[in-house]
């Protein structure tokens, strides 16, 4: 298997919101979980968007996860991963 | 490293309200993270009660919504538990422990403070 | 609210055997599961996260697994040191809800 390189980013929504997102690229199998956690549980489905799983072109594969939040409360936020048995989470990037 | 200690009174009477500290050194609770209190009835039942976090916004268990308040006092690093109109039921030993927000698991607790609920 | 079922309610066995703690949860927690040891008048210590994840400083002969509702802890070659009681808890949600517990005795 390959694991997958994960980069949050964030971006301006509307005032006082940001979106966030959590995107998995260069992996293989195509099988992932790529989702949000707020304060340390899972985050509704419903506030989250989520990317189709596509070859990037060089037989692994990329995605995404999204969910749009209150500036200021990043730090309540962490993207969580997990592909082939292995798993990791990651932050929201200080403004 | 950090490290949390639980106190106060080891007896309430039936209707008081119960008010226990949790000191933490070593860490400000203001920087990150989650800090709870659990209680662990007699029979070994583990219940997590709530929590207030490093930005002092609070979460309660629902079924003791109307009796609990988690609040801190940051100039101490210290946060408090308060349970009003106990009961016999409220006899458990008491436990503040920490998350982070990778995941709400327990890597940090106190030892106990056994409160018995006695007329 | 998710309640988390626990088996068996003790269980006793010899140094050197294999046991398995099982959890079941009242609904999907997606790997949001931990796991915890605790002994006679001490704090629940942690073992495992989101699973699988043996925490820092927790011996290989512990190993979790599962998916879905079903997990399960499992002690591999059992030591003196293993005796106490083990609960499961998950994260999925609030409120989070523990196991009501195993205790493991040693024969």
């Known amino acids: 298997s390959v694991p997958p390189m994960v980069n949050v980013t964030r971006s301006e929504a509307s005032e006082g919101n940001i979106t966030v997102t959590c995107r998995a690229s260069s992996f293989y199998p195509r099988n992932i979980t790529l989702t949000w956690r707020q304060d340390g549980v899972s985050l509704s489905h419903d506030t989250q968007q989520w990317g189709d799983v596509l070859p990037d072109g060089n037989g692994t594969y990329q995605t995404w996860v999204a969910t749009r939040i209150c500036q200021g409360e990043e730090q309540r936020f962490t993207c969580y991963m997990e592909h082939s048995g292995n798993h990791s989470t990651h932050p929201v990037p200080s403004g | 490293d950090v490290q949390l200690q639980g106190s106060g009174p080891g007896l309430v009477k039936p209707s008081q309200s119960l008010s226990l500290t949790c000191s933490v050194t070593g860490y400000s609770i203001t920087n990150d993270y989650y800090w709870n209190w659990i209680r662990q009835f007699p029979g070994n039942k583990l219940e997590w009660m709530?929590?207030?976090?490093?930005?002092?916004?609070?979460n309660y268990n629902p079924s003791l919504k109307n009796r609990i308040s988690i609040t801190r006092d940051t100039s101490k690093n210290q946060f408090f538990l308060k349970l009003s109109s106990v009961t016999t039921e409220d006899t458990a030993t008491y436990y503040c422990?920490?998350?982070d927000g990778r995941g709400a698991w327990f890597a940090y607790w106190a030892q106990g403070t056994l409160v018995t609920v006695s007329a | 609210d998710i309640q988390m079922t626990q088996s068996p309610a003790s269980l006793s066995a010899s140094v050197g055997e294999t046991v398995t703690i099982t959890c079941r949860a009242s609904?999907?927690?997606?790997?949001?599961l931990a796991w915890y040891q605790q002994k006679q008048g001490k704090s629940p210590q942690l073992l495992v996260y989101d699973a699988i994840t043996l925490a820092d400083g927790v011996p290989s002969r512990f190993s979790g697994s599962g998916s879905g509702t079903q997990y399960s802890l499992k002690i591999n070659s059992l030591q003196p040191e293993d005796f106490g009681n083990y609960y499961c808890q998950h994260f999925w949600s609030f409120p989070l809800t523990f196991g009501a517990g195993t205790k493991v005795e040693i024969k």
């Open positions: 709530g929590f207030i976090s490093f930005g002092g916004s609070n």
């Open positions: 609904g999907n927690i997606h790997n949001y």
């Open positions: 422990a920490r998350y």
